[in-house]
Amino acid sequence: YDFTNCDFEKIKAAYLSTISKDLITYMSGTKSTEFNNTVSCSNRPHCLTEIQSLTFNPTAGCASLAKEMFAMKTKAALAIWCPGYSETQINATQAMKKRRKRKVTTNKCLEQVSQLQGLWRRFNRPLLKQQ
């Protein structure tokens, strides 16, 4: 999906109002400095591409974050503010339901969510140059 035509300001507002709190809840006191940031993004569409990938695609050591509250709210925000996004996700959602597993918060998942927080920061502060 091409995120170029999304309403970035509305997505930013959704992050700051709810998604950020759900990510912090998931991290449960784990500090962002406890992990190295290995994923980055260069502009807002790129950030959303990386956010979608880390949020919804299973990775080694972290089977699925897609059923977490922050993921569901991310999905809703993208569906509302990115034209045509929901249509592209129907097949992916059906496949994900077949793979659904018991939720376990592993250290790898905490690291992945920490990466997500970094990507969201970059999305929300696109004009701030990386130091």
Partner: antibody
Amino acid sequence: QVQLQESGPGLVKPSGTLSLTCAVSGDSISNYNWWSWVRQPPGKGLEWIGEIYHSGRTNYNPSLKSRVTLSVDTSKNQFSLRLSSVTAADTAVYYCARDAPSDYGDYGFFDHWGQGTLVIVSS
Amino acid sequence: DIVMTQSPLSLPVTPGEPASISCRSSQSLLHSNGYNYLDWYLQKPGQSPQLLICLGSDRASGVPDRFSGSGSGTDFTLKISRVEAEDVGVYYCMQALQTPYTFGQGTKLEIK
């Protein structure tokens, strides 16, 4: 608004145990904050003692770790400091402080402090 | 532990004039996320410390814009563009990259 209030004895005997409590109002101690203790000897600088999360997870300053115990009481919305085997060098103003997360999971910002309580170690 | 060193330790300033305080850390405070975990606090006489700047350059809520933080890695600066009488007190830098959090020795700003 968020307020923190330290309480405890102002005088402790050498080799005794210093015990302080920080009562939190305007915020739930079970929110996603770390809660710290910082001390300041008279006329000197600030020293971080340690921190506790509502789950009971702790981080301590290694220089004090063998003598410090932090605890949290979510039902009373307060957290406590115990410092054992005290000497005159532990005489200081003791502050409790809130370390609230940023929108991106950053910690390390003490945005609210108690007014401090002076503890003197003397016989 | 990360050692924080401030200079000068004493800073007499005329009201309306600028002021600058330096803080140096024994190791880099720049995280891989691109942010510096360095705070500035002001402790006014007889009061508790108050947060001025976090992440090296982000002003805390309610802090006047005459205060600004800059720097990266191991060298940081707090600038006051025009000192006011209410700015007197001791300024501390603190590293928040790792525990134990450590403070600089403090810089006492006084009015000439």
